[in-house]
């Protein structure tokens, strides 16, 4: 007899066939915290920009992705130092001069305010109450971020 | 009254919450490959190094990590042109003066036999046929992964 | 406990080395970016170089480039820093200091040893 | 190089008053700034980073304001241990990290 588990195996897949939806997550893996439809990992050790964003592509996660102002407070909120930075998913793209998500979508400028230059070799790290450009090199903390509800249609095409 | 889908929501938190187990892929999303216990995904598209793993980790996937030689020849079988080179997630750390997997772990030199030089800005490819180091600005295909199974407390502690 | 402690100091005469370590202990070396701090006899202080937890970066203070060299060696908890062609005015107690973690190259000085002095004398 | 000027660079005060120390910076550091104390013979100890948030462990008599050139250091009731010397220090992201001149709190 088949486990509720497994059960739900073919349950999920018949939906995904119907809908091209892939299992989402359901809720967020122990140690993350949820907010909104994100899970989100800050990391308590330091490393480069590059590195971080290994760490959470090995976790089969992102550097986080901020979509709006409301959002980057939300996050904010959740860190406890003011002088604390973690790393995002938001670097200087030298060949598009311009700001660039690790999602392939620009800035829209009017979301974050930046202090700092915007420059080759230039990443991007939240503080308690601000938003920084740094070098890349430089070694701090990171958030990794993991979509918590299944989307539909999701079906990952190259970016 | 739930449909099966909130039901296996139910199911797999309280099967999380007893084993600390994440709610992991059942299945493999529409247009991944299954190769044993992993999903892969091989782009269409081009990218350097950098952006390849950018995308996987937008994708809440890894670069593809390579465990020994048989996993290697069963990926490299899934290549249908001998002549396509694919990223994998193994670049040269030039601190360490070695070849490194995303995940932080060192390559075994018996694992994979790799043409070319270990030296900075050095990224590893896969063929049909061969291993090869290259320029990790170089643009070419690349391959993600997700881990198909649930593992028993993946817990995701920094690296 | 949480500690730094300097030892290679002493006198040299001008032109000569020195090599000055710093032993950590009681908190997570590897995750810190580490510097050494100076300060003359009746002076102020002055920073002289820092090196980023993983050795990657590292800077100096204009006044010692080219004849001073900070290490680290993660594994030993330790700090180094080689001091060459020395001159009257390296004279000073040197400190090791600790930045608060994570504030990337904004290096705030949380932690301190109690200094080491250098003399260089004919 | 952002060059930090204290003022005064010596004060005489008594148990009980309230102290106020100011450093300006040749050009703005938004808020990077700490201020350190420091006793004869002792090390350097860190009250105030980020130019307001108060150090673990540090009374709270002690407080930190401003942002981009001009900054404070308050001290509201003078204690008989805060005699010292306090320096305040820039910590932009771009080395050299250059320290105040100083200033020398005396007893009156």
């Known amino acids: 007899q088949k486990s509720s588990i497994e059960k739900c195996s073919v349950d999920i897949q018949q939906s995904r066939n119907k809908t091209t939806e892939r299992p989402g997550l359901l809720n967020c893996p122990i140690y993350w915290q949820q907010l909104r439809e994100k899970c989100l990992l800050f990391s308590h050790t330091v490393n480069p920009w590059n590195n971080s964003l290994a760490d959470c592509s090995t976790k089969e996660s992102s550097l986080l992705l901020i979509r709006d102002k409301d959002e980057l407070i939300h996050t904010q909120n959740l860190i406890r130092d003011k002088a604390i930075l973690f790393w995002i998913g938001l670097n200087f793209s030298l060949s598009e001069k311009n700001w660039k998500w690790i999602n392939g979508s620009f800035l829209n400028s009017n979301d974050l305010e930046i202090r700092g230059d915007a420059k080759e070799n230039s990443c991007i790290s939240i503080s308690q109450t601000s938003v920084y450009s740094e070098y890349c090199s430089t070694e701090i903390r990171w958030i990794c971020q993991k979509e918590l509800t299944p989307v539909r249609n999701k079906v990952y095409p190259d970016s | 009254q739930k449909s099966s889908i909130e039901k296996c929501s139910v199911d797999i938190q309280q099967s999380r919450n007893k084993t600390t187990e994440r709610p992991g892929l059942l299945n493999c999303p529409i247009y991944w490959q299954q190769l044993r216990e992993k999903c892969l995904l091989f782009s269409h598209t081009v990218n350097p190094w950098n952006n390849s793993l950018a995308d996987c980790s937008t994708k809440e996937s890894s670069l593809l990590l390579i465990r020994d030689k048989d996993e290697l020849i069963h990926t490299q079988n899934l290549i249908r042109d001998k002549a396509i080179l694919f990223w994998i997630g193994l670049n040269f750390s030039l601190s360490e003066k070695n070849w490194k997997w995303i995940n932080g772990s060192f390559l075994n030199s018996n694992d994979l036999e790799i043409r070319g030089d270990a030296k900075e800005n050095s990224c590893i490819s896969i063929s049909q046929t061969s291993v090869y180091s290259e320029y990790c600005s170089t643009e070419i295909r690349w391959i993600c992964q997700k881990e198909l199974t649930p593992v028993r407390n993946k817990v995701y502690p920094d690296s | 406990q949480v500690q730094l402690v300097e030892s290679g100091g002493g006198l040299v005469k001008p032109g000569g080395s020195l090599r000055l370590s710093c032993a950590a202990s009681g908190f997570t070396f590897p995750q810190y970016y580490m510097s050494w701090i100076r300060q003359a006899p009746g002076k102020g202080l002055e920073w002289v170089s820092y090196?980023?937890?993983?050795?990657?970066?590292?800077y100096y203070a204009d006044s010692v480039k080219g004849r001073f060299t900070i290490s680290r060696d993660n594994a030993k908890n330790s700090l180094y820093l080689q001091m060459n062609s020395l001159r009257a005015e390296d004279t000073a107690v040197y400190y090791c200091a600790r930045s608060l973690m994570s504030t990337g190259t904004h290096l705030y000085f949380d932690l301190w040893g109690r200094g080491t002095l250098v003399t260089v004398s004919s | 190089d952002i060059q930090l000027t204290q003022s005064p660079s010596s004060v005489s005060a008594s148990v009980g008053d309230r102290v106020t120390i100011t450093c300006r910076a040749s050009q703005g550091i938004s808020s990077w700034l700490a201020w350190y104390q420091q006793k004869p013979g002792k090390a350097p100890k860190l009250l105030i980073y980020?130019?307001?948030s108060l150090q673990s462990g540090v009374p709270s008599r002690f407080s930190g304001s401003g942002s981009g050139t001009d900054f404070t250091l308050t001290i509201s009731s003078l204690q008989p241990e805060d005699f010292a010397t306090y320096y305040c220090?820039?910590?932009?992201?771009?080395?050299?990290?250059?320290f105040g001149g100083g200033t020398k709190v005396e007893i009156k």
């Open positions: 980020a130019a307001s």
């Open positions: 090196i980023s937890p993983s050795g990657a970066t590292i």
């Open positions: 220090q820039q910590v932009t992201s771009t080395p050299p990290y250059t």
